[in-house]
Interface confidence: low
């Protein structure tokens, strides 16, 4: 009869164990092993009990113990179990931004590791459990599909590799993947909402919003605004899901024409965008051109007015005929026209929009100077000792200098109140002098005595 | 100036090791996901690995060096570090760290590379 | 893993031409392909994400675009220092992956 010890053995990949072949009669013909495993025997007393050191093993094998004594020959086996964690525990690859709402399908592979009847794969999120398989197959594939919600923003997704030997008085081994950390987003199919003006002037400047709501993670979000080659450099302002993003603008003659405004906005592995076009104008304000901005009176004076080429203008309230960038007008010039206001009103459609524009320009009549009835009388009777102003205005453009001088030297104090009195009775010569010219008149002073009463 | 600097390469024997580092100055380099890329002699770029952001960052490799590179960070120092092991004459290459910016693996700011050369 | 496809592999230009690359990713990215231009012994440059989206500080002479799983990179007015090898890149899933290049010489 023949026995071995131990009968069952569960051992780690690579390692060794003693086995002992043993036999009930005293002097065995035979007494040995069979095994494809390297060997050692251990020397002992006796011829009825042998020790073999059996090493590197590799996987399950059953070495048998044989011996032939005078009653026959008998065998007997010993189970031997390798155990080893799998060499490979990996979730397979996936982009790190999911959007919210999509089925994500998790999966994990496991290579090597046995016994396979006490390895088993674990999914889970976090901590918790999603799904527990035995591993099956070569490599062993365990899938599962999960529902991407917000609040699965950041949490790790990995697979573990639970090897229970406990029940053969082991402990549990455990492998675990690298995590997948999961990056969810929510981004609207709705495009980003884009106010800004529908023309803009050159050398202006604008402003620009762009704003979108529903976004999740909102500050993860991106927000790129181009106006043509333009990058602008928005300010952004949060809410809980929503941004702001508002930009100024300014352009140049080289951006003149139809320019496409881009507002774009990225969240994970997606984007929106919403163009929109605003024109870019030159406009300069019209121009109002006088032959001559100072001119003598009755001299003849064009006024000009001119815009751009696109531009219908009206001078003084007047359109151009035919309606169109210049106007003109003729007149001679008079003193009433001395510091009148031209006025153009340029008017120019942009992009459906009317643009208005104007300027005024002044003319300067020379005149005079004048001396009149009117303003400057020539007879004055006033009573003696009463109190009286003598007046002469002289008028012309320049405003000219005026003196009324009796006898070429006593004047008569213009504008002054006076009492009267003989020495002021006589007959002034008013002189009024500018750079147009020069012009007299004779002013009589009469004094009452009251001795004519 | 945002700057990425390269050290640690140099010879080694097919089967050695080798241990790259990468400096980072002038961004918050504990912010950012972080990468290496290599680029053989006159061939094209290839991804090598990328490590996460935060507290217990999270690696990922390709196939060709999984198993025997290891990628760390350290950001109190501002450092990215590529353990090599088991080095291939396929190895060869100049590896450049760069830094990773969203979406996805965007790579905006290389460093000037370093180059590994495995030759018996 | 995406394989990203580059044509022309290398082209002759002249400084003001105007030049197109195209790329194909053998599956759908969105529009997560990013492109990069290296100079000899130098690290690559990012010049557009997102497709069609300009790096910060790169002339506007360059343009991105995207026709389903094909990419393009536009250079409007070629100038004498554009001259380099331009690589595209899908940043849509793990591994990103590169296209083989294309390498843009005077002529």
């Known amino acids: 009869q023949t026995s071995v010890s131990p009968s069952k053995v569960i051992l780690p990949r690579g390692g060794s164990v003693l086995v002992t072949c043993s036999t009930s009669c005293d002097q065995p013909k035979l007494l040995g092993i069979e095994t494809p495993l390297p060997k050692k025997e251990l020397l002992l007393p006796g011829n009825n009990r042998k020790v073999y050191e059996l090493s590197n093993v590799q996987e399950d094998s059953q070495p048998m113990c044989y011996s032939n004594c005078p009653d026959g020959q008998s065998t007997a086996k010993t189970f031997l179990t390798v155990y080893w964690t799998p060499e490979r525990v990996e979730l397979a690859p996936l982009p790190s931004w999911q959007p919210v709402g999509k089925n994500l399908t998790l999966r994990c592979q496991v290579e090597g590791g046995a016994p396979r009847a006490n390895l088993t794969v674990v999914l889970l999120r976090g901590e918790k459990e999603l799904k527990r398989e035995p591993a099956v197959g070569e490599p062993a594939e365990v899938t599962t599909t999960v529902l991407v919600r917000r609040d699965h923003h950041g949490a790790n997704f990995s697979c573990r590799t639970e090897l229970d030997l406990r029940p053969q008085g082991l402990e549990l081994f455990e492998n675990t993947s690298a995590p997948y950390q999961l990056q969810t987003f929510v981004l609207p199919a709705t495009p980003p909402q884009l106010v800004s003006p529908r023309v803009l002037e050159v050398d202006t400047q604008g402003t620009v919003v762009c704003s979108l709501d529903g976004l999740f993670p909102v500050s993860e979000a991106q927000v790129h605004l181009a106006l043509g080659d333009q990058r602008l450099n928005p300010t952004v302002t949060y809410g809980n899901d929503s941004f702001s993003a508002k930009a100024s603008v300014s352009v140049t003659a080289e951006d003149e024409g139809t320019q496409r405004l881009t507002c774009a906005v990225i969240l994970g592995n997606q984007s929106q965008e919403t163009l929109q076009t605003v024109t870019i104008y030159s406009f300069p304000a019209p121009n109002v051109i006088l032959t001559k901005p100072e001119v003598s009176e009755g001299t003849e004076v064009t006024v000009k007015c001119e815009a751009h080429p696109r531009a219908k203008v009206t001078l003084n309230g007047v359109p151009a005929q035919p309606l169109g960038p210049r106007a003109q007008l003729l007149l001679k010039a008079t003193p009433e026209d001395n510091g009148r206001s031209f006025s153009c009103s340029a008017t120019l459609e942009v992009a459906g929009q009317l643009i208005h524009k104007n300027q005024t320009r002044e003319l300067r009549v020379l005149y005079g100077p004048r001396l009149d009835e009117r303003d400057c009388p020539g007879n004055w009777t006033w009573p003696e000792n009463s109190q009286q102003t003598p007046m002469c205005q002289a008028w012309g453009n320049p405003l000219p200098e005026l003196k009324c001088l009796k006898d070429g030297t006593f004047p008569l104090p213009i504008g002054e109140s006076v009492t009267v009195t003989r020495d002021l009775e006589g007959t002034y010569l008013c002189r009024a002098r500018s750079t147009q010219g020069e012009v007299t008149r004779k002013v009589t002073v009469n004094v009452l005595s009251p001795r004519y009463e | 100036e945002v700057q990425l600097v390269e050290s640690g390469g140099g010879l080694v024997k097919p089967g050695g090791s080798l241990r790259l580092s990468c400096a980072a100055s002038e961004f918050t380099f504990s912010d950012y996901f972080m990468s290496w890329i290599r680029q053989a002699p006159g061939k094209g770029l290839e991804w090598v690995s990328y490590i996460s952001s935060g507290r217990s960052p999270y690696t990922n490799y390709a196939d060709s060096v999984k198993g025997r590179f290891t990628i760390s960070r350290d950001n109190a120092k501002n450092s990215l570090y590529l353990q090599m092991n088991s080095l291939r004459v396929e190895d060869t290459a100049v590896y450049f760290c760069?830094?990773?910016?969203?979406?996805?693996?965007?790579?905006?700011?290389w460093g000037q590379g370093t180059l590994v050369t495995v030759s018996s | 893993d995406i394989q990203m496809t580059q044509s022309p592999s290398s082209l002759s230009a002249s400084v003001g031409d105007r030049v197109t690359i195209t790329c194909r990713a053998s599956q759908d990215v969105n529009t997560a392909v990013a492109w990069y231009q290296q100079k000899p012994g130098k690290a690559p440059k990012l010049l557009i994400y997102?497709?069609?989206f300009l790096y910060s500080g790169v002339p506007s002479r360059f343009s991105g675009s995207r026709s389903g799983t094909d990419f393009t990179l536009t250079i409007s007015s070629l100038q004498p220092e554009d001259f380099a090898t331009y690589y595209c890149q899908q940043h849509y899933t793990t591994p990103p992956t590169f296209g083989q290049g294309t390498k843009v010489e005077i002529k």
């Open positions: 760069a830094r990773v910016r969203g979406p996805g693996d965007v790579f905006d700011i």
């Open positions: 997102s497709a069609s």
